[in-house]
C-alpha cells in the first residue's frame, strides 16, 4: 500500500528562521498537499510535477520546493509565531494517503529553551465530522490528521 | 449540513460583466472548500473555480482564467464569482458548491447549489 513518509516529527525554531519539511512516497501520485491542521485545517500548498505550485497567500513568498512530487522538501522562511502547528502532507493517489505530521514550534528566540520537541511524533486521530444541525466542531479533536477520504476525481 | 443558494445570475452582453453570489446557511461555513461549476444545454457539468477555505488559494479551468475572479467573505458565509469579459460559450447554469475540508484541485462537492441561469448573448 502507498504510504507518505514525513520528517521531520517536529521542530523548534526562532521567529524569522527557515524549516523544512520532506514529504516522500513510492510514487504513483498525481500531486501532493501539504495541510496545517488547527481548529481550521487548511491546505496551504499543492504541488505537481510540471505545474506552477499553488501557496496560500500567508505563505507567498516564504515558501520554496526542491525535489518531485514523489520526493518533496518544502522549505517555509521567515517563520512566524503564527505559524506554529503541525504540517501534514497528503498524496493524492487512488487513495489518498497522508504523512505522519510534523510540529513546528516558533518561538521567540529568548524563549527557546522552554519550548522543546519530544521524540514522539504527532498525534493521529481523527479530523472533525462535518458539523450537524448548529454545532461547530470541537477544535481539541481538530489538530490530528484525518481517515484517508475515498478516492477523490480531478475536477 | 450546508445548503447552497446561489444569485446574480441573467442575461448579459458579449464582453460583459456579471457577478455570481452563493450564500451558504448552516455552520463552519470557514472549514469548506468552495467552487464553481457549470452546465450548458446538452453538455457535461464543467469545473470553473474553486477557492481555499481561508480564501487564500484559487484555482481556475484554463477557460476562464484571467477572465473570472473567485473570492469569498467568511463572516457573510458568502463565496462569490466575477465575470468578466463574458463570451457566447459561458451560457450555462453555474451551480455553486461546497466540500468540507475539501482539496482545491481535486474537489468533489459535498453539497450543491441548485444554479442560476446565465446567459451571454447579443
Known amino acids: 500500500a502507498q504510504e507518505v513518509q514525513q520528517s521531520p516529527h517536529c521542530t523548534t525554531v526562532p521567529v524569522g528562521a527557515s524549516v523544512n519539511i520532506t514529504c516522500s512516497t513510492s510514487g504513483g501520485l498525481r500531486g501532493i498537499y501539504l495541510r496545517q491542521l488547527g481548529p481550521q485545517p487548511q491546505d496551504i500548498i499543492y504541488y505537481e510535477d510540471g505545474v506552477v505550485p499553488t501557496t496560500d497567500r500567508r505563505f507567498r513568498g516564504r515558501i520554496d520546493f526542491s525535489g518531485s512530487q514523489d520526493n518533496l522538501t518544502i522549505t517555509m522562511h521567515r517563520l512566524q509565531l503564527s505559524d506554529t502547528g503541525t504540517y501534514t502532507c497528503q498524496a493524492i493517489t487512488e487513495v489518498n494517503v497522508y504523512g505522519s505530521g510534523t510540529l513546528v514550534l516558533v518561538t521567540e528566540e529568548q524563549s527557546q529553551g522552554w519550548h522543546r520537541c519530544s521524540d514522539a511524533p504527532p498525534r493521529a486521530s481523527a479530523l472533525p465530522a462535518p458539523p450537524t444541525g448548529s454545532a461547530l466542531p470541537d477544535p481539541q479533536t481538530a489538530s490530528a490528521l484525518p481517515d484517508p477520504p475515498a478516492a477523490s476525481a480531478l475536477p | 449540513q450546508v445548503q447552497l443558494q446561489e444569485s446574480g445570475g441573467g442575461l448579459v452582453q458579449p464582453g460583459g460583466s456579471l457577478r455570481l453570489s452563493c450564500t451558504a446557511s448552516?455552520?463552519?461555513?470557514?472549514?469548506?472548500?468552495m467552487g464553481w461549476f457549470r452546465q450548458a444545454p446538452g453538455k457535461e457539468r464543467e469545473f470553473v473555480s474553486t477557492?481555499?477555505?481561508?480564501?487564500?488559494?484559487?484555482y481556475y479551468a484554463d477557460s476562464v482564467k484571467g477572465r473570472f475572479t473567485i473570492s469569498r467573505d467568511n463572516a457573510k458565509n458568502t463565496v462569490y464569482l466575477e465575470m468578466n469579459s463574458l463570451k457566447p460559450e459561458d451560457t450555462a447554469v453555474y451551480y455553486c458548491?461546497?466540500?468540507?475540508?475539501?482539496?482545491?484541485?481535486?474537489?468533489?462537492?459535498?453539497?450543491w447549489g441548485k444554479g442560476t441561469q446565465v446567459t451571454v448573448s447579443s
Open positions: 458548491a461546497a466540500e468540507y475540508l475539501g482539496n482545491l484541485r481535486h474537489f468533489r462537492g459535498d453539497h
Open positions: 477557492i481555499s477555505a481561508s480564501g487564500g488559494m484559487t
Open positions: 448552516g455552520r463552519a461555513f470557514s472549514m469548506y472548500v
